[in-house]
Interface confidence: low
Amino acid sequence: ARWFPKTLPCDVTLDVPKNHVIVDCTDKHLTEIPGGIPTNTTNLTLTINHIPDISPASFHRLDHLVEIDFRCNCVPIPLGSKNNMCIKRLQIKPRSFSGLTYLKSLYLDGNQLLEIPQGLPPSLQLLSLEANNIFSIRKENLTELANIEILYLGQNCYYRNPCYVSYSIEKDAFLNLTKLKVLSLKDNNVTAVPTVLPSTLTELYLYNNMIAKIQEDDFNNLNQLQILDLSGNCPRCYNAPFPCAPCKNNSPLQIHDNAFNSLTELKVLRLHSNSLQHVPPTWFKNMNKLQELDLSQNFLAKEIGDAKFLHFLPSLIQLDLSFNFELQVYRASMNLSQAFSSLKSLKILRIRGYVFKELKSFNLSPLHNLQNLEVLDLGTNFIKIANLSMFKQFKRLKVIDLSVNKISPSGDSSEVGFCSNARTSVESYEPQVLEQLHYFRYDKYARSCRFKNKEASFMSVNESCYKYGQTLDLSKNSIFFVKSSDFQHLSFLKCLNLSGNLISQTLNGSEFQPLAELRYLDFSNNRLDLLHSTAFEELHKLEVLDISSNSHYFQSEGITHMLNFTKNLKVLQKLMMNDNDISSSTSRTMESESLRTLEFRGNHLDVLWREGDNRYLQLFKNLLKLEELDISKNSLSFLPSGVFDGMPPNLKNLSLAKNGLKSFSWKKLQCLKNLETLDLSHNQLTTVPERLSNCSRSLKNLILKNNQIRSLTKYFLQDAFQLRYLDLSSNKIQMIQKTSFPENVLNNLKMLLLHHNRFLCTCDAVWFVWWVNHTEVTIPYLATDVTCVGPGAHKGQSVISLDLYTCELDLTN
């Protein structure tokens, strides 16, 4: 028997190892806490709803609660949705939480609260009150939080949630929180470091405030502190995509020479966007455990050439010096201090936005002996000249990132390597990075309403490429021609990203010849001309090739396209040729004895497979090992007969989504003996097969969402015992009969999706209503989105909550 009602509009999961019962009611349009929450619930999430108040009755009987996530039920107006503004702040009645003796974590962010709630249980270890209207912190309001370990008070007073007053913190307000480990006061217009802070702190977040000076004693007793973030105080405002106020006279954050003396355990120090011009070594004299130092978005271009402070950082693993360029200066080359050579533990070095013209081998000489270095990021530097051969010194690197530069090929085969004749006016070198906001985000660690954990801030490296090994990222440069000498001495590379360049040459199989170990080549967003079937054949170990978004020559008539180039790539596993508008091919078939995955989205198979033209029906047939074929978005309103006969023999996954298919030859699936997944979503199909099992005995996953299916055939799933996943969501299904859905088949399903249909909840639906109420099959959104369109009184009602006992109930046959 089920231990919670199916009418509960929430997802219930068990975390057996942790002995947790998790109830997630995120974004369910709730205006009250739903009934039927299991009494043994430990983790309850009610974020993104419209519940106006919390009272002692709200969690009555939920005595086992360990965590309540009640965020974003009344988001401050500037932060919230403009079409659903919350004008009455969340009301929390006295003693609402006091009976929850096991409660450890309480998230109340985004509720327009004016003060820290009172009557909290002593068990509480984490309290999060971000994005409210709390801008006065008094000692008396914190007295109940004796056992608190994590306290988030950020985003209560900043440009997106203004408070129009000075944020005030009473002296010693936090001192009695003797178990406090994590304190966040970020994004709050705080003007000074609150003192005295408890010595138990391990993490202190004071970023994006209005602190102009760090005093000698501010962190005096914090000898357990591991993370300190002071970023965004006295910010560097150039090109900031948010309202930004620098300190007076653009002065840097003033930090007393001894301010960090007590921070002997510090591992992470973030001083991003503090307008720093110098970094005194004395700051770091007691910081020999520091592993991560962020000095990005300052004015440290000159300091990078001196940088004596680096000698004090033997444990440093990650160093970020990005976007420290001097305004209106375009340097000839990069000047790295010899002190970089002392960073023996360094794994990641990022120097984007230094802005210089030529990358020379000796520029990187201080890094040559850094044996642990894994990532060297020199993206967005407007480099025009770079001899890539210099990277033979960095064979141990996992990632060499030169993306978003202005590198282009040299005019001859001399040792100059890549160069450019692009214009050199300084105005064109202002970093244009708003598309990939990392260094230019106001708060890159901000949480959204949907997730409790902070958002990850990824860098641009293509992770699927990176996992193959040593990576060189040359994406978004100005390369219009490649030749083998460009890649001399780079035989160690496993992944090369050339995406987003201007390469329009006819590759003949010689250009990448030195890259003997290359496994992954991203050639997307170029202008590939497939004149030769020998293209890429020199890459003997190539496993993944992405030539997506190379539509330029495919869009022109009369041009030779040798799609059979795959024949020569003996170990190619995956080929992506999406969004190429391919409508013609000189070769009739593609051939490969290794290819397992082909992505062919966004092309014009409708033209290649035009009615009456059988020449290309076997285009994919000789991809003998092909298991996955994605031919979605190919404008295929119908499939000509012979298409399935021309499919590769081992095909397991076939996607025909987003094609505008009006009909489908279900019987032809018999040709695909190994087919396990068929995706026909986002088409215009109106019918399902008479009997699926007559069409395929192997099909496990059938995806028919977003079609125009109005009814299911009488024996649709009869004998389809292999089926495990069926998605019929977002169709126009009005009725499901017992014969269409035999229970001996349905009970094998791991997942059945039925939401967003047009169920008619008449007495004819009585079996269906009974079945959804009794089945153990997982039906997502059952309580909220499997609803009736009629008749009358039932409109909008959940199928699961229908009372059809007035109908004659006969479930025997």
Epitope: N369, Q371, E374, K395, R396, K398
Partner: antibody, heavy 125, light 107 residues
Framework: EVKLVESGGGLVQPGGSLRLSCTTS????????MEWVRQPPGKRLEWIAA??????????EYSASVKGRFIVSRDTSQNILYLQMNALRAEDTAIYYC????????????????WGAGTTVTVSS | DIVMTQSHKFMSTSVGDRVSITCKAS??????VAWYQQKPGQSPKLLIY???TRHTGVPDRFTGSGSGTDYTLTISSVQAEDLALYYC?????????FGGGTKLEIK
């Protein structure tokens, strides 16, 4: 074929000394961290010492139980790893294995992909 | 030092069975756990590292899993030649430390 062969084990009195050797072949010796791991009778494996690779200056690291008594070194010309054991105690009785760190692009992984067959050291009066 | 605990010193199984050997670390070792197999009279042989990555040449019936402090080595279908001692080892922090071993016996 990668091979590690230990030698030099034997019976020694408490307070005595012994030098173990590990002769290696089949790989570039100086590119790899090399480790000594021992296994006392009926007890768990215990890492005792490491000699870092050339890129890390062949520096050394020891467990607390042997620090100050044992010295690890290597002869890169002959591809031999040594363990000089001084002030031996009864609790040093074990099979001593030479092992190669798995190596990740020149960095230590602290797990070991190749092991020798071991040599037995008995400390007893 | 990080202590690795293998609570079962012995485990008895039959050929063809699925067996799981567990290991607990005294602190979070961030999936930096290796597993070794040691057959009688032989030296240890690396099976798994980073909790779940199979070493070259190791049969795919051996799989590793886990995170935080709890780790498991699973043999999906035990073969006679799998009779051996199995050790876990953390490679998160120096010194690297080993579990006490679990001896797999074939019934």
């Amino acid at each position: 074929e990668v091979k590690l062969v230990e030698s030099g084990g034997g019976l020694v009195q408490p307070g005595g000394s012994l030098r173990l050797s590990c002769t290696t072949s089949g790989f570039t010796f100086s590119d790899f961290y090399m480790e000594w791991v021992r296994q006392p009778p009926g007890k768990r494996l215990e890492w005792i010492a490491a000699s870092r690779n050339k890129r890390n200056d062949h520096t050394t690291e020891y467990s607390a139980s042997v620090k100050g008594r044992f010295i690890v070194s290597r002869d890169t010309s002959q591809n031999i790893l040594y363990l000089q054991m001084n002030a031996l105690r009864a609790e040093d009785t074990a099979i001593y294995y030479c092992a190669r760190d798995a190596d990740y692009y020149g960095s230590s992984t602290w797990y070991f992909d190749v092991w020798g067959a071991g040599t037995t050291v008995t400390v007893s009066s | 030092d990080i202590v690795m605990t293998q609570s079962h010193k012995f485990m008895s199984t039959s050929v063809g069975d699925r067996v799981s050997i567990t290991c607990k670390a005294s602190q979070d070792v961030r999936t930096a756990v290796a597993w070794y197999q040691q057959k009688p009279g032989q030296s240890p042989k690396l099976l798994i590292y980073w909790a779940s990555t199979r070493h070259t040449g190791v049969p795919d019936r051996f799989t590793g899993s886990g995170s935080g402090t709890d780790y498991t080595l699973t043999i999906s279908s035990v073969q006679a030649e799998d009779l051996a001692l199995y050790y876990c080892q953390q490679h998160y922090n120096t010194p690297p430390t080993f579990g006490g071993g679990t001896k797999l016996e074939i019934k």
